[in-house]
């Protein structure tokens, strides 16, 4: 539910409550959609997306697609629902606070994807192997 | 504790334009997160815009960007949305709500956290 004076709808995503009933802020998440990107062989880059989005739905997180083709490399990014598959994966590090790049097999690219969950975190994204989640610590964040 | 009170809505002809007004009681204004939000007739909350406390950064919905400007003065404990070249799909009641660092839910039934409301009618 929402504050009393707030009608109820039925039915509609746009609300997320936790077992309370108190209603969940949205995501702010970098969403530019699909850009061409500099972005090579570094540990990490910034987006360098102007645009900071609020999420249409409480429930979304942010996202990031990273692709690497014969022609060019582009990134994407966006809110979406980890309930839903994003280019027919699942986003299973959703809950971490950091976007931590995973390849993800396509065929005829090279293909990463992250997902976060805290304001703006698909604006740095990072690919370097010492921000992997066998790291402990990064696993504590997450989970807490 | 802030108290939120919304003022400026009204009747309006598509492609026109309102200023909302919020004004806070309290002299906690400075510490939140301000946002408007809205919610069209049997429909779900939409979190329109919101605006940061230091810096005035500002955030908007894909749905407003470019028609929509918030803006605060934390002199006067207000927060304001402009809103331009309104359509009928802008009809709804809108809402301030504020949030503290690192909030991420706002309590049901709290006054303080929510306004009542100011209704804008996009209709020719």
């Known amino acids: 539910t929402i504050p009393p004076h707030v009608q109820k709808s039925v039915n509609n995503d746009m609300i997320v409550t936790d077992n309370n009933g108190a209603v969940k802020f949205p995501q702010l998440c970098k969403f530019c959609d699909v850009r061409f990107s500099t972005c090579d062989n570094q540990k990490s880059c910034m987006s360098n997306c102007s645009i900071t989005s609020i999420c249409e739905k409480p429930q979304e997180v942010c996202v990031a697609v990273w692709r690497k083709n014969d022609e060019n490399i582009t990134l994407e990014t966006v809110c979406h629902d980890p309930k839903l598959p994003y280019h027919d994966f699942i986003l299973e590090d959703a809950a971490s606070p950091k976007c931590i790049m995973k390849e993800k097999k396509k065929p005829g690219e090279t293909f990463f994807m992250c997902s976060c969950s805290s304001d703006e975190c698909n604006d740095n994204i990072i690919f370097s192997e010492e921000y992997n989640t066998s790291n402990p610590d990064l696993l504590l964040v997450i989970f807490q | 504790e802030v108290q939120l009170l919304e003022s400026g809505g009204g009747l309006v002809q598509p492609g026109g334009s309102l200023r909302l007004s919020c004004a806070a009681s309290?002299?906690?204004?400075?510490?939140?997160r301000m946002w408007w939000v809205r919610q069209a007739p049997g429909k779900g909350l939409e979190w329109v815009s919101?605006?940061?406390?230091?810096?005035?950064?500002?955030y908007y919905a894909n749905s407003v960007r470019g028609r929509f400007t918030i803006s605060r003065d934390n002199s006067k404990n207000t927060l304001y949305l402009q809103m331009n070249s309104l359509r009928a799909e802008d009809t709804a009641v809108y809402y301030c709500a504020k949030q503290a660092p690192n909030q991420r839910y706002v309590a049901r039934g709290r006054l303080d956290y929510w306004g009542q409301g100011t209704l804008v009618t996009v209709s020719s």
């Open positions: 309290g002299s906690t204004f400075t510490e939140y």
């Open positions: 919101a605006i940061e406390p230091i810096g005035h950064r500002t």
